[in-house]
Interface confidence: low
């Protein structure tokens, strides 16, 4: 038994969740949704689950409903990654996985879905209403993120209704090319969904078939500075007291992004779609929890009293985040 919350509600319903009439009524919206997804407006779903057997253990599962190839997945808590959220794990389909406490196991479930287990005992566990976010960077859709959390009143072992609506931030470039007809269809879909708002939101346990282990391998990025993905975010407040969460600050991406796929040059240029922020050519994967990210070189210095992390003969580097000067 488990408590779970899922985002978004825009998921194919499980058989038996609704009566025959209700199911038939939703056929058209799902067809339209499929068209929307394949036409360049992908969705991200997030499922947060708390095991009844281990109350401090959370499982976050995220999936990408889009046709593009996923280049990076970032899981964060406390709000969107880049807007005060703390990164828990970063998964790259080729270059492997890196994670941060209290993440215990991050893994690919399929080519388009991931799971992450958060461990904890007592104080080290996230509170039940913590917001968890998954951001999928893909080509050509761009960056999409959704967030979800367990309802504060969730009792272990009881199924919680899914979060009613997704929190999505789309790279504007990701919706270029959508025809007017499909846009109308999507609007109509939303209209239909709003009419069905009084119903329990349909749920989908994303397929666990054909799991793909990440092809982790040693990787040496090119020395050239590359463009980083940058998406404007809206801050999501969590009702957790700050003391119960590891504080986070805005930050840059991992050094994995120092070498982008060859098709990067063909990414559509939309407003705030791809910023020209330089990424370190080669260097450490700096924990984003601290909020520092060296734009070049091995390690950012810290502004804490008397604390210098691996002094670099190349001198000071530009940094992102509140503890450094950009």
């Amino acid at each position: 038994m488990r408590t779970e919350a899922q985002v978004p509600a825009l998921q194919p319903p499980e058989p038996g969740l609704e009566g025959a009439m209700g199911h038939r009524t939703l056929v058209l919206p799902w067809v339209l949704l499929t068209l929307c997804v394949t036409a360049g407006t992908p969705e991200v779903w997030v499922q947060v689950r708390m095991e009844a057997t281990e109350l401090s253990s959370f499982t976050i599962r995220c999936g990408f409903l889009g046709s593009g190839s996923i280049s990076l997945v970032t899981v964060s808590w406390g709000g969107p990654n880049g807007a005060g959220g703390t990164t828990l794990a970063v998964l790259h389909p080729e270059r492997g996985i890196r994670q941060w406490a209290p993440a215990r196991q991050a893994r690919w479930e399929t080519q388009s879905s991931i799971s992450l287990i958060l461990e904890g005992s007592g104080a080290s566990s996230p509170c039940a209403n913590t917001t968890f976010c998954c951001k999928f960077a893909s080509f050509p859709e761009g960056s999409w993120e959704a967030c979800g959390s367990l309802p504060p009143s969730s009792d272990p072992g009881l199924s919680a209704p899914p979060t009613p609506a997704p929190i999505l931030r789309a790279d504007l470039a990701g919706i270029l090319g959508v025809s007017g007809v499909l846009l109308f269809g999507c609007v109509y879909l939303l209209h239909l969904l709003r009419r069905h708002k009084h119903r329990p939101a349909p749920r989908l346990q994303p397929s666990r078939t054909s799991p793909q282990a990440p092809r982790a391998r040693a990787w040496a990025p090119s020395q050239a500075s590359q463009a980083a993905l940058h998406v404007p975010y809206a801050t999501i407040n969590t009702s957790c007291r700050p003391a119960t969460l590891d504080t986070a600050h805005p930050h840059g991406g991992p050094s994995w992004w120092a070498s982008l796929p060859t098709h990067a040059a063909h990414r559509p240029q939309g407003p705030a779609a791809w910023a020209s922020t330089p990424i370190p050519a080669r260097g450490s994967f700096v924990s984003v929890e601290n909020g520092l990210y060296a734009q070049a070189g091995e390690r950012p210095p810290h502004t804490g009293p008397g604390l210098t992390l691996f002094p670099d003969p190349r001198g000071p580097r530009a940094m992102e985040g509140p503890l450094g000067v950009r």
């Epitope: 215990r104 982790a216 040693a218 994967f285 700096v286 924990s287 804490g304 992390l309």
Partner: antibody, heavy 119, light 107 residues
Framework: QVQLQESGPGLVKPSETLSLTCTVS?????????WNWIRQPPGKGLEWIGY???????NYNPSLKSRVTISVDTSKNQFSLKLSSVTAADTAVYYC????????????WGQGTTVTVSS | DIQMTQSPSSLSASVGDRVTITCRAS??????LHWYQQKPGKAPKLLIK???DSISGVPSRFSGSGSGTDFTLTISSLQPEDFATYYC?????????FGGGTKLEIK
């Protein structure tokens, strides 16, 4: 530069509680990072005991979890280890160490303090 | 728990030799593998992080490679000060676990 210094009794009787303190200088313990305890029995390898994060969150090695408590005293800029019901197998050099940026590795360590469990 | 198996447990070599130490994880730890050097009576010192990332201040003769479950620490040309015990450490999943160590001795 941050420095860590372990302190505590060098001799503990079996079944008693081992208590060690790590005093941190050069950095505010409540500001960031994870503060760890690691031990090394004589002539043997290293074993991670657990950590306390800057915000008070803890994580312990399951093999020791029932006996371990790690706490922090921000007013003294210290964090402490308590290991109950000790036996001779707990005789070791105990190190405190800091993890910068989480999984980047234990960069700074204390010099270690030897604890012998004997009656 | 993830078990880390280091080999060899001891190694005799001469100054100028090229030395390779291996570490195997019982399950995939991706790149979350770090190498340490420990000298008698001293605390361990971080040599390599994330399997292959060098550390500022550590001589360039130390290098690391590998990903997943198999990792290697290489010392390209042994120096007198390199004779010590070397440990690998996985920080992918708690409990963090060290390898059993490789004692590098002078031949």
């Amino acid at each position: 530069q941050v420095q860590l210094q372990e302190s505590g009794p060098g001799l503990v009787k079996p079944s008693e509680t081992l208590s060690l303190t790590c005093t941190v200088s050069g950095y505010s313990i409540s500001s960031d990072y994870a503060w760890n305890w690691i031990r090394q029995p004589p002539g043997k390898g290293l074993e991670w005991i657990g950590y306390i994060r800057y915000n008070g969150n803890t994580n312990y090695n399951p093999s020791l979890k029932s006996r371990v408590t790690i706490s922090v005293d921000t007013s003294k800029n210290q964090f402490s280890l308590k290991l109950s019901s000790v036996t001779a197998a707990d005789t070791a050099v105990y190190y405190c160490a800091i993890i910068y940026y989480d999984y980047d590795g234990f960069v700074y360590w204390g010099q270690g303090t030897t604890v012998t469990v004997s009656s | 728990d993830i078990q880390m198996t280091q080999s060899p447990s001891s190694l005799s070599a001469s100054v100028g030799d090229r030395v390779t130490i291996t570490c195997r994880a019982s399950q995939n730890v991706y790149e979350n593998l770090h190498w340490y050097q420990q000298k008698p009576g001293k605390a361990p010192k971080l040599l390599i992080k994330f399997a292959s990332d060098s550390i500022s201040g550590v001589p360039s003769r130390f290098s690391g490679s590998g990903s997943g479950t198999d990792f290697t620490l290489t010392i390209s040309s042994l120096q007198p000060e390199d004779f010590a015990t070397y440990y690998c450490l996985q920080l992918y999943s708690t409990p963090y676990t060290f390898g059993g160590g490789t004692k590098l001795e002078i031949k």
